[in-house]
């Protein structure tokens, strides 16, 4: 048999060897399709399926616009002006060039040793779905799931049966001052169709620099609260990707899980004392917070005492 | 809302003439096929004639064969039947339809014209 | 010529009740099969599309199957707006052929 590829949408015509060109003919076409359960014998004389089948004067099959549910075999069987009997196969598969992929959510710039997403490249209307690769520097990319990373998602639509594909890349450059040019392709797969290309993106790569500085804030401001208040500290920080952030009362660590905020609710004597937060940063040794006082007065009308936080509620490390 | 109006019915004698027109809108006629069912007076539902989205093929049972011709005007939203050398068992409620071919079958009908074939 | 052969013809049942109407294709017509609902004086309305979908608009207590060449309409609990008459249609071969007909009756 012969493999045919048709685009989706387009006509295609199946030729039915040994078939005279003009009537009377003795021929016959059947189909497997996404159409039929099993074969169907299509009617020389037309009918219903002429819409997406129809037998020509000359004895081809004339499909007018493929679709997905036409992938499948075609067989004529004819007998040719001198009585003998010839047959002619067809596995058609239909696709779709998709719209040219692009870079959606392109980061501004990456980070050195640490994990940074590159961006999200997105191909929309394929079939099949066909695959999504990343390069750097015009060279392919391939994911080895610890300096770079791909997360990939498929989707197809329910009603037109297309594929939209989705590929994160995440990197972890090894060195800053470089500028790498990072590009996405689609392919097919098919013969004689080349990939399509998104545009490049060029990003500049940073040494991780330190922190570049570590607020806490306190609310209610200044760390007076009444028994039974809510104290909520906020450990400000601008480093990237954010850091983990421990918390200290009173020199000593507080046997918290990781967060930026700590909350301290029904607040009573035992809660007061002295805050701070360490940040500690993949690349950098821990940075701590300047720290703040918390007291609980019955009255909350005493002013702040010595070593507690000043009227702006924040502790700022330059 | 997707509408079909046939018009053009009537009383006529046995051996005559007469056209029908269904006016289609609310949706891209020249996309569809289609269709001509007529209903005699207290029977069931008899197909008369199908036409593709293009107008190149005409599809007819024997019964009508040669004494009817579909046709369709796709920039006027239209779709005709002539029907000639009437006989008094063309007597029927003539619907138009949406359709015909396998993609659809048959989904919307208009409301039907009357035909009477009788001396 | 494909022939549909619809049975019963006619049938008496009441509000609640649950119908079902069959149509017989003398020969494979795959899923190619309509079912409509056609009131007195009314156009028919299509219920259900290429054997066993719904289509827009139909209550739920409508449902299509098929077994090899046999084609079932189900309604599940019949109501006082479902008193009519139903046919099939098979549109997979020329000429495209109606069943003749069920009409549903009020007990």
């Known amino acids: 048999g012969q493999n045919i590829t048709a685009r989706i949408g387009e006509p295609l015509v199946l030729s039915c060897k040994g078939a005279p060109k003009k009537p009377p003919q003795q021929l016959e076409w059947k189909l497997n399709t996404g159409r039929t359960e099993a074969w169907k014998v299509l009617s020389p004389q037309g009918g219903p399926w002429d819409s997406v089948a129809r037998i020509l004067p000359n004895g081809s099959l004339l499909l007018p616009a493929t679709g997905i549910v036409d992938e499948g075999t075609f067989r004529c069987r004819a007998t040719n002006r001198r009585g003998k009997e010839v047959k002619s196969n067809y596995r058609v598969r239909v696709y779709q060039i998709p719209g040219k992929p692009e870079i959606v959510d392109p980061a501004s710039e990456l980070t050195a040793s640490v994990p940074n997403k590159v961006g999200t490249c997105v191909s929309e209307g394929s079939y099949p779905a066909g695959t999504l690769s990343w390069h750097l520097d015009g060279k392919l990319l391939i994911p080895d799931g610890k300096e770079t990373l791909v997360k990939e998602e498929t989707r197809r639509h329910p009603e037109t049966g297309l594929f939209t594909l989705r590929s994160e890349l995440t990197v972890i450059p090894t060195q800053g001052g470089t500028h790498p040019t990072f590009s996405c392709s689609f392919s097919l797969g098919l013969p004689r169709r080349r990939p399509l290309n998104t545009a490049p993106i060029q990003l500049r790569v940073r040494e991780p620099g330190p922190p570049e500085g570590i607020q806490l804030l306190v609310e209610p401001e200044g760390g007076i609260v009444a028994p039974g208040g809510t104290v909520t500290l906020t450990c400000a920080i601008s480093a990237q990707p954010p850091p983990q952030v421990h918390w200290i009362k009173d020199g000593a660590p507080l046997p918290l899980a990781p967060s930026p905020v700590l909350l301290l609710p029904e607040v009573g004597h035992e809660d007061e004392g002295t805050y701070s937060c360490v940040a500690t940063h993949p690349s950098h040794g821990p940075q701590e917070s300047p720290p703040v006082s918390i007291r609980v007065t019955e009255t909350g009308d005493e002013g702040p005492a010595e070593g507690s936080v000043g009227e702006s509620g924040l502790g700022t490390l330059a | 809302e997707v509408q079909l109006v046939e018009s053009g019915g009537g009383l006529v004698q046995p051996g005559g003439s007469l056209r029908l027109s269904c006016a289609a809108s609310g949706f891209t006629f020249n996309n569809y096929w289609m269709t001509w069912v007529r209903q005699a007076p207290g029977k069931g539902l008899e197909w008369v004639a199908s036409?593709?989205?293009?107008?190149?093929?005409?599809y007819y049972p024997d019964s009508v064969k040669d004494r009817f011709t579909i046709s369709r005007d796709n920039a006027k939203n239209s779709l005709y039947l002539q029907m000639n050398s009437l006989r008094a068992e063309d007597t029927a409620v003539y619907y138009c339809?949406?359709?015909?071919?396998?993609?659809?079958?048959?989904?919307?009908w208009g409301q039907g014209t009357l035909v009477t074939v009788s001396s | 010529d494909i022939q549909m052969t619809q049975s019963p013809s006619s049938l008496s049942a009441s509000v609640g009740d649950r119908v079902t109407i069959t149509c017989r294709a003398s020969q494979d017509v795959g899923i190619y099969v309509n079912w409509f609902q056609q009131k007195p004086g009314k156009a028919p309305r299509r219920l259900i599309y290429?054997?066993?979908n719904l289509a827009d608009g139909v209550p739920s207590r409508f449902s299509g199957s098929r077994s090899g060449t046999d084609f079932t309409l189900t309604i599940s609990s019949l109501q006082p707006e479902d008193f009519a008459t139903y046919y099939c249609l098979e549109f997979d071969e020329h000429p495209l052929t109606f069943g003749g007909g069920t009409k549903v009756e009020i007990k």
């Open positions: 290429r054997a066993t």
């Open positions: 036409i593709d989205n293009s107008g190149d093929n005409t």
């Open positions: 339809a949406r359709g015909g071919d396998i993609t659809l079958g048959l989904d919307v």
